[in-house]
């Protein structure tokens, strides 16, 4: 059974992940057209279901494409290097989802833009955090 200290650690990690994802989204939302139009041609795959920490496998598998987009479309005003940012996210995701059980991610048929993708995982984090508090 999870202890209060492990629950607190999970909550803090989720809050950190949430902040990282929100930071990326805020950066993208500051982009103007036609740059935003170009960025929205990148497609991301969404999980069929995302209600448990193990479902973070689906986020982990899309981190490489996310880094690629951020590298290619990086604004000179965006001071965090995409590689460092994604590396931080990857470490948190690996800790949160655990490595004991191998979970095969199932993706929805529809693809998503980077904005929809980030919003989906932001909502996921907020939802799990709310169940822990």
């Amino acid at each position: 059974a999870p202890t209060s200290s492990s629950t607190k650690k999970t909550q803090l990690q989720l809050e950190h992940l949430l902040l990282d994802l929100q930071m990326i989204l805020n950066g993208i939302n500051n982009y103007k057209n036609p740059k935003l139009t170009r960025m929205l041609t990148f497609k991301f795959y969404m999980p069929k279901k995302a209600t448990e920490l193990k479902h973070l496998q689906c986020l982990e598998e899309e981190l490489k494409p996310l880094e690629e987009v951020l590298n290619l479309a990086q604004s000179k005003n965006f001071h965090l290097r995409p590689r460092d940012l994604i590396s931080n996210i990857n470490v948190i995701v690996l800790e949160l989802k655990g490595s004991e059980t191998t979970f095969m991610c199932e993706y929805a048929d529809e693809t998503a833009t980077i904005v929809e993708f980030l919003n989906r995982w932001i909502t996921f984090c907020q939802s799990i955090i709310s169940t822990l508090t």
């Epitope: 139009t37 497609k43 795959y45 987009v69 290619l72 479309a73 604004s75």
Partner: antibody, heavy 121, light 113 residues
């Protein structure tokens, strides 16, 4: 080996329909836009538009909108270009080409060998 | 649509000598926020499909010899071949991909003198 293989040459009459194909292999076909390029006899290259096989999202160049249809079957890693009613002016070589995860951020790095379409009465 | 204009139309070259092709766009292909210039160069050898030579202004595509180089500013671009070889003959095209629809230049035919 990453490659795109196109269907063979076609000879058609005006008013007939046609569907040509472009099969990808050696990479994650669903994750890359596939562009279509026309080359009329003795002329230059014209970008017709592009399709994302992962969800069949299509973008047509205004010059080709309503003239052709792009489609894809991701289960067999194949993209298609079709005409419902061919005209003599559709006579050309048609190429498919891989355009990366975004057709804005990547050049066309892999090309099919081309399909010659001849429309004549 | 962005219009891409190439010069010259035809370029007779001598093997071992340098050659350059120009391309001009009707509007800037530079995104100053990103620092990306959305211009590519393709070579279509006789009887073959086009092949990507240079992407995003100056990056050589995989397997492309280093005798090919791309340069330029917002609207004026150059493809240089430091020492032309017989296998370099064909039609060279520039292409913009900063704006929809993507557009090609009319092509420059390079042939051996």
């Amino acid at each position: 080996e990453v490659q795109l293989v196109q269907s063979g040459a076609e000879v058609k009459k005006p008013g007939e329909s046609l569907k040509i194909s472009c099969k990808g292999s050696g990479y994650g076909f669903t994750n890359y836009w596939i562009g279509w390029v026309r080359q009329m006899p003795g002329k230059g290259l014209e970008w017709m538009g592009t399709i994302y096989p992962g969800d069949s999202d299509t973008r047509y160049s205004p010059s080709f909108q309503g003239q052709v249809t792009f489609s894809a079957d991701k289960s067999i890693s194949t993209a298609y270009l079709q005409w419902s009613s061919l005209k003599a002016s559709d006579t050309a070589m048609y190429y498919c080409a891989r355009q990366g995860r975004s057709y804005y951020y990547f050049g066309m790095d892999v090309w099919g060998q081309g399909t010659t379409v001849t429309v004549s009465s | 649509d962005i219009v891409m204009t190439q010069t010259p139309l035809s370029l007779p070259v001598t093997p071992g000598e340098p050659a350059s092709i120009s391309c001009r766009s009707s509007q800037s292909l530079l995104d100053s926020d990103e620092g990306n210039t959305f211009l590519d160069w393709y070579l279509q050898k006789p009887g073959q499909p086009p092949q990507l030579l240079i992407y995003t202004l100056s990056y050589r595509a995989s397997g492309v010899p280093d005798r090919f180089s791309g340069s330029g500013s917002g609207t004026d671009f150059t493809l240089k071949i430091s020492r032309v070889e017989a296998e370099d003959v064909g039609v060279y095209y520039c292409m913009q991909r900063i704006e929809f629809p993507l557009t090609f230049g009319g092509g420059t035919k390079v042939e051996i003198k």
